[in-house]
């Protein structure tokens, strides 16, 4: 089992985050297009 040092505020330290969001219509305050990581 994991020891506490493997976690930072409940998040696994080594886990990759989502990709940076894409704002294709950047000149408007639009919703982002998010593309999930392929593991």
């Amino acid at each position: 089992s994991y020891s506490m040092e493997h976690f930072r505020w409940g998040k696994p330290v080594g886990k990759k985050r989502r990709p940076v969001k894409v704002y294709p219509n950047g000149a408007e305050d639009e919703s982002a297009e998010a593309f999930p990581l392929e593991f």
């Epitope: 886990k15 940076v20 969001k21 704002y23 950047g26």
Partner: antibody, heavy 113, light 112 residues
Framework: EVQLVESGGGLVQPGGSLRLSCAAS????????ILWVRQAPGKGLESIGM???????YYATSAKGRFTISRDNSKNTLYLQMNSLRAEDTAVYYC???????WGQGTLVTVSS | DIQMTQSPSTLSASVGDRVTITCQAS??????LAWYQQKPGKAPKLLIY???TLASGVPSRFSGSGSGTEFTLTISSLQPDDFATYYC??????????????FGGGTKVEIK
């Protein structure tokens, strides 16, 4: 108008510190992923760090331990605190709204004695 | 950190030519790849994201392909306004020990 405006660049001696600001207008900075990218004179683009919309920050190896990204939501502004500056940090520094066409105009940082 | 290797670094071409630029990632990044165009003294302009999706207002002569570690930007018929420097960018996720955002070294497309 949606835009980012950087400020705070200038001439600094090796080993010195500088804080760059990235002021957002037309959108709420805390709702978006923001990158810091630099470009040395005549060279290519280099991503040095980012802050996700939730406030988490990540840094390239070249910036880790020396650079810190923070955010002031009340001022709708992001900051890049740069310490222990070296000659190779000389560049135009841009803040960027995620992956998009919203880039600041850039601010030049020159590290020289 | 992710390493992005772009080739060629310089490309001499004529108006009307078909131009291909390649980008290789040091690790698989799925389709989290963008292409930017930069002209001297200007901020980069987004051309393509998600490896193959054209950004708003970008002419259809630009196209992108690839996934995983190998990517390509193609200009089907080079126009005078296309002489510029092109960069690929990975924008996959980061972790405490890995930074997944990186640019290729750039490809300068110049007039032959």
């Amino acid at each position: 108008e949606v835009q980012l405006v950087e400020s705070g660049g200038g001439l600094v001696q090796p080993g010195g510190s500088l804080r760059l600001s990235c002021a957002a207008s037309g959108f709420t900075v805390s709702a978006y992923d923001i990158l810091w990218v630099r470009q040395a004179p005549g060279k290519g683009l280099e991503s040095i760090g980012m802050m996700y919309d939730d406030g988490d920050t990540y840094y390239a190896t070249s910036a880790k331990g020396r650079f810190t990204i923070s955010r002031d939501n009340s001022k709708n502004t992001l900051y890049l605190q740069m310490n222990s500056l070296r000659a190779e940090d000389t560049a135009v520094y841009y803040c960027v709204k995620g992956v998009s066409n919203i880039w600041g105009q850039g601010t030049l940082v020159t590290v020289s004695s | 950190d992710i390493q992005m290797t772009q080739s060629p670094s310089t490309l001499s071409a004529s108006v009307g030519d078909r131009v291909t630029i390649t980008c290789q990632a040091s690790q698989s990044i799925g389709s989290s790849l963008a292409w930017y165009q930069q002209k001297p003294g200007k901020a980069p302009k987004l051309l393509i994201y998600s490896a193959s999706t054209l950004a708003s207002g970008v002419p259809s002569r630009f196209s992108g392909s690839g996934s995983g570690t190998e990517f390509t930007l193609t200009i089907s018929s080079l126009q005078p306004d296309d002489f510029a420097t092109y960069y690929c960018q990975s924008y996959e996720g980061s972790s405490s020990s890995y930074y997944g955002i990186g640019f290729g070294g750039g490809t300068k497309v110049e007039i032959k």
